[in-house]
């Protein structure tokens, strides 16, 4: 039986201080758990590296917008 209650929570404790080019980004997910000390975004790069970023930063918001738009474009 799935043990969702005790599922591990991923948190970000530090944010990247470098702006990442959107061409290097493949996806993102939001950390919204109240168990985490910071609201955060985890970007996954095209080489599958995960990077914590601050959702308050403009470049982070713009990158999320860019990735969102890609989800409505059919992959050919």
């Amino acid at each position: 039986q799935p043990d969702a209650i005790n599922a591990p929570v991923t948190c970000c404790y530090n944010f990247t201080n470098r702006k990442i080019s959107v061409q290097r980004l493949a996806s993102y997910r939001r950390i919204t758990s109240s168990k985490c000390p910071k609201e955060a975004v985890i970007f996954k790069t095209i080489v599958a590296k995960e990077i914590c970023a601050d959702p308050k930063q403009k470049w982070v918001q713009d990158s999320m917008d860019h990735l969102d738009k890609q989800t409505q474009t059919p992959k050919t």
């Epitope: 919204t32 609201e39 975004v41 999320m64 917008d65 969102d68």
Partner: nanobody, 123 residues
Framework: EVQLVESGGGLVQAGGSLRLSCAAS????????MGWFRQAPEKEREFVAL????????FYSNSVKGRFTISRDNAKNTVTLQMNSLEPEDTAVYYC????????????????WGQGTQVTVSS
């Protein structure tokens, strides 16, 4: 946690206009894609419109395109839906939603929802 409160619903005659507002509180408003959805009696909840975090991109369902306009004010933590040329088919409960996860118009990518506001269009 993001709290969303809708207002502006009501009863209007066909051809009339309404302006729905959604006030957000809690976490960083500008870091969420915002959307409006609606649910008519006995029907599934359906996507109406969305606006990107920057406000630079909007997207509408075919049924409201050209009649509804979505906008946002990140300084005031609000998103509005201007609804013109209303039709009886627009009658529904309208929900404001904040999209945290990667996606577009899919309801499953919106983590936070308001309680909804009733819009009734009479013929």
């Amino acid at each position: 946690e993001v709290q969303l409160v809708e207002s502006g619903g009501g009863l209007v005659q066909a051809g009339g206009s309404l302006r729905l507002s959604c006030a957000a509180s809690g976490r960083t408003f500008s870091s969420y894609r915002m959307g409006w959805f609606r649910q008519a009696p006995e029907k599934e909840r359906e996507f109406v419109a969305l606006i990107s975090r920057s406000g630079g991109t909007t997207f509408y369902s075919n049924s409201v395109k050209g009649r509804f306009t979505i906008s946002r004010d990140n300084a005031k933590n609000t998103v509005t839906l201007q609804m013109n040329s209303l039709e009886p088919e627009d009658t529904a409960v309208y929900y404001c939603a904040a999209g945290a996860q990667m996606g577009w118009a899919e309801a499953s990518t919106y983590d936070y929802w308001g309680q909804g506001t009733q819009v009734t269009v009479s013929s």
